[in-house]
Interface confidence: medium
């Protein structure tokens, strides 16, 4: 999957664009909005009818090195009585993000963009049933 | 930055941390995943906290199209298909990294940008604070 060139005719390539070798691109990994923080409702992972846990994955050759993944705690959903109801289902919600992967080949180092699928949390859904015969 | 183990036979000049600027291959590794959530899953309709998906497009960003979730109701859908206001639909938000063209309009020069997206909604028990 290649990153598309700017296709719009009104985007003229500015003279100030840095020279880049063919087949590659220049990437500044000083993150814009680095200090932005998620302002989600408090403890939604525990208060949800489809609660989830978080696991931190760590990889020193990835930037950012930490990626947090959610896992649904239950097969079913938590009902009004606080019991698990298996007639409903807790399912994971996923979102793609980009990371930079560092690759070592002998003593040389190269960098590659990678799409990572992150499980963000869980939601409670009504099941869909298919009759197979 | 992040520290990595290095081949002891390599010259010492290599920085153990990620450099501020890197040259990366134009091909994105991993998946040609389906980035349209409307096609990849119907959770937004089947959920007890359903949501609508709004297309956010920006040609100066990669990916240029990002789908934002907005919860349809304040409450959650109960077993009878009605909105129950004793429970709340709330967005699940996630910080993701995207590429921002920098300088603007340059075809092969980018900077990482962190953006906050609402990915979907979940049904939660409300927290009620007594203020007086």
């Amino acid at each position: 999957r290649k990153i598309p060139k700017v296709g719009h005719t009104f985007f003229q390539k500015p003279e100030s664009c840095p020279p880049v070798p063919g087949g590659s691109m220049k990437l500044d990994i000083g993150i814009i909005n680095e200090n932005q923080r998620v302002s989600m409702s408090r403890n939604i992972e525990s208060r949800s009818t489809s609660p989830w846990n978080y696991t931190v994955t760590w990889d020193p050759n990835r930037y950012p090195s930490e990626v947090v993944q959610a896992q649904c705690r239950n097969l079913g959903c938590i009902n009004a009585q606080g019991k698990e109801d298996i007639s409903m289902n807790s399912v994971p919600i996923q979102q793609e993000t980009l990371v930079v992967r560092r690759k070592h080949q002998g003593c040389s180092v190269s960098f590659q963009l990678e799409k990572v699928l992150v499980t963000v949390g869980c939601t409670c859904v009504t099941p869909v049933i298919h009759h197979v015969q | 930055g992040i520290t990595i183990p290095r081949n002891p036979g390599c010259p010492n000049s290599e920085d153990k941390n990620f450099p501020r600027t890197v040259m990366v291959n134009l091909n994105i590794h991993n998946r040609n995943t389906n980035t349209n959530p409307k096609r990849s899953s119907d959770y937004y309709n089947r959920s007890t906290s359903p949501w609508n998906l709004h297309r956010n497009e920006d040609p100066e960003r990669y990916p240029s199209v990002i789908w934002e979730a907005k919860c349809r109701h304040l409450g959650c859908i109960n077993a009878d298909g009605n909105v129950d206001y004793h429970m709340n639909s709330v967005p699940i938000q996630q910080e993701i990294l995207v590429l921002r063209r920098e300088p603007p309009h340059c075809p092969n020069s980018f900077r990482l940008e962190k953006i906050l997206v609402s990915v979907g909604c979940t049904c939660v028990t409300p927290i009620v604070h007594h203020v007086a």
Epitope: C72, L75, N89, V91, P92, V125, T126, P127, V128, I129, H130, H131, V132 | S41, Y43, R46
Partner: nanobody, 122 residues
Framework: EVQLVESGGGLVQPGGSLRLSCAAS????????MYWVRQAPGKGLEWISA????????YYAESVNGRFTISRDNAKNSLYLQMNSLKSEDTAVYYC???????????????GGQGTQVTVSS
């Protein structure tokens, strides 16, 4: 082609027991979550039990908890439901079901066969 064939139903008195079986074919049985669902006359499908691929995690609906036991034999591609202390409200057609996808739960299921009728009556 996925096939799920239920058997073991019948007429039983209240307080009695039955053991249902489901013979599965056409998919890698040992990789899938498996389920028992039932449909009482004039009602919708009711999820009564679920079992993880390795057999470790089991789930039961409140209406059957403590009376029914789900189990599986991956070598025989078979799913079982041991039903004890049966009540008249357990009267229904019982079906076995599997996850629609392997490895990633989406809340989609496949069920098949004609089911097996369980009638609890004195």
């Amino acid at each position: 082609e996925v096939q799920l064939v239920e058997s073991g139903g019948g007429l039983v008195q209240p307080g009695g027991s039955l053991r249902l079986s489901c013979a599965a074919s056409g998919f890698t049985f040992s990789s899938y979550w498996m389920y028992w669902v039932r449909q009482a006359p004039g009602k919708g499908l009711e999820w009564i039990s679920a079992l993880a691929p390795g057999g470790g995690n089991r789930y039961y609906a409140e209406s059957v908890n403590g009376r029914f036991t789900i189990s599986r034999d991956n070598a025989k591609n078979s799913l079982y439901l041991q039903m004890n202390s049966l009540k008249s409200e357990d009267t229904a057609v019982y079906y076995c079901a599997k996850d629609h996808n392997v490895g990633y739960r989406t809340g989609e299921y496949d069920y098949g066969g004609q089911g097996t009728q369980v009638t609890v009556s004195s």
